[in-house]
């Protein structure tokens, strides 16, 4: 079998809301993946599991099941959303993200994603990690591919 390539394209949108009383930040982060099937037969994308970390703490998880199938030598673009919560012991971040003296409130998040594909009963997992800047002070949307090179650094695959 030939490879199945997973490419993390970047953040498609980041929508922020706050709970003032609880000093909590809610960030809904939608990411984009390109999955390429280099085989001459179809493969199923069985699931995508994703998590987001801030300062080595997991702040959000998501799982998508029975997503799609990808035809021979085809590529599909898949968006997935991870709801994240920055709260409790990290509530000091609420002060930063709502600071009224500045307009830009960048934080660095680590995006982790694992794609599970199946073909002929065989299962394969491909993982990616990427550090990304997100502005926790406002909503942000991107045109396709606009955020492709936003990584702070790319860890070894």
């Amino acid at each position: 079998p030939r490879s199945i390539d997973v490419k993390y394209i970047g953040v498609k949108s980041a929508y922020v809301s706050y709970d003032v009383q609880k000093r909590t930040i809610y960030l809904n982060i939608t990411n984009t993946l390109n999955i390429t099937n280099n085989n001459y037969y179809s493969v199923e994308v069985e699931n995508i599991t994703a998590q987001v970390q801030f300062a080595k703490t997991v702040i959000g998880k998501a799982r998508l099941n029975n997503i799609t199938h990808i035809g021979p030598l085809d590529m599909k673009q898949i968006d997935y959303t991870v709801p994240t919560v920055i709260a409790e012991e990290m509530s000091y971040m609420y002060d930063f993200c709502t600071l009224i003296s500045i307009k830009v409130h960048n934080i660095v998040l680590m995006m982790q994603v694992t794609v599970t594909t199946t073909y002929f009963g065989h299962s394969e997992q491909i993982s990616q990690e990427r550090y990304q800047y997100v502005d926790c002070g406002r909503n942000t949307t991107y045109q396709l591919g606009q955020s492709e090179y936003l990584n702070v650094l790319q860890p070894q695959q």
């Epitope: 922020v16 307009k103 502005d135 406002r138 955020s147």
Partner: antibody
Framework: EVQLQQSGPVLVKPGPSVKISCMAS????????IHWVKQSHGKSLEWIGL????????NYNQNFKGKATLTVDTSSRTAYMELNSLTSEDSAVYYC???????????WGQGTLVTVSE | DIVMTQSPSSLSVSVGEKVTVSCKSS????????????LAWYQQKPGQPPKLLIY???TRESGVPDRFTGSGSGTDFTLTISSVQAEDLAVYYC?????????FGAGTKLELK
């Protein structure tokens, strides 16, 4: 429908001060920054500053420090701007507006015309 | 403070015409972290408050017709109206949404030929 209801037009003499108001309805007052913007007749827009109703925190344009004072009364869901040492240069339409925290200013009041004249 | 320079100051147009308004900032409005440009465009009709059209340099506010397009990066930005309608006659302002104090361009007045 979201509303920022501003007080009516005022005609004042040069010298003391004037206080104009902006009452919020249909949205959570504490969840938004309230901005004040000046528009002199036929001119562009000048950002005066903002106030955060939740804690009364303010951020002023240095050009308006000492000229404008921004306050809020959360019980009546009203933001206020007081202009002091009035001169004819202060004659303008003053808008209050809101933004969801650091998002762009998305909604504006109808404006209050302040005329400073003898 | 960031100075916003708009051109032209006024524009005479016919209905159906394509229009471009230019805006230059004295400092970059790019958030180098997330690669978004923090520039907004507002439309103001006579006797009315400004209305947000575009934010993040290129994202249309909900309900804004798709004939309005924002583009540009860093210090150079453009608002394009692909086919001007009678209801588009107004003054258009660009605004620095990157740092305080928020600053506006002098405006571009769209008039009917």
């Amino acid at each position: 429908e979201v509303q920022l209801q501003q007080s009516g037009p005022v005609l004042v003499k040069p010298g003391p001060s004037v206080k104009i108001s902006c009452m919020a309805s249909v949205f959570t007052f504490n969840d938004y920054y309230i901005h004040w913007v000046k528009q002199s007749h036929g001119k562009s827009l000048e950002w005066i500053g903002l106030v955060y109703p939740y804690n009364g925190g303010t951020n002023y344009n240095q050009n308006f420090k000492g000229k404008a004072t921004l306050t809020v009364d959360t019980s009546s869901r009203t933001a206020y701007m007081e202009l002091n040492s009035l001169t004819s240069e202060d004659s303008a339409v003053y808008y209050c507006a809101r933004s969801y925290f650091s998002n762009p200013i998305g909604y504006w009041g109808q404006g209050t015309l302040v005329t400073v004249s003898e | 403070d960031i100075v916003m320079t708009q051109s032209p100051s006024s524009l005479s147009v016919s209905v159906g015409e394509k229009v471009t308004v230019s805006c230059k900032s004295s400092q970059s409005l790019l958030n180098s972290g997330n690669q978004k440009n923090y520039l907004a465009w507002y439309q103001q009709k006579p006797g009315q408050p400004p209305k947000l059209l575009i934010y993040g340099a290129s994202t249309r506010e909900s309900g804004v017709p798709d004939r309005f397009t924002g583009s540009g990066s860093g210090t150079d930005f453009t608002l394009t109206i692909s086919s001007v309608q009678a209801e588009d006659l107004a003054v258009y302002y660009c605004q620095n949404d990157h740092s305080y104090p928020l600053t506006f361009g002098a405006g571009t007045k769209l008039e009917l030929k």
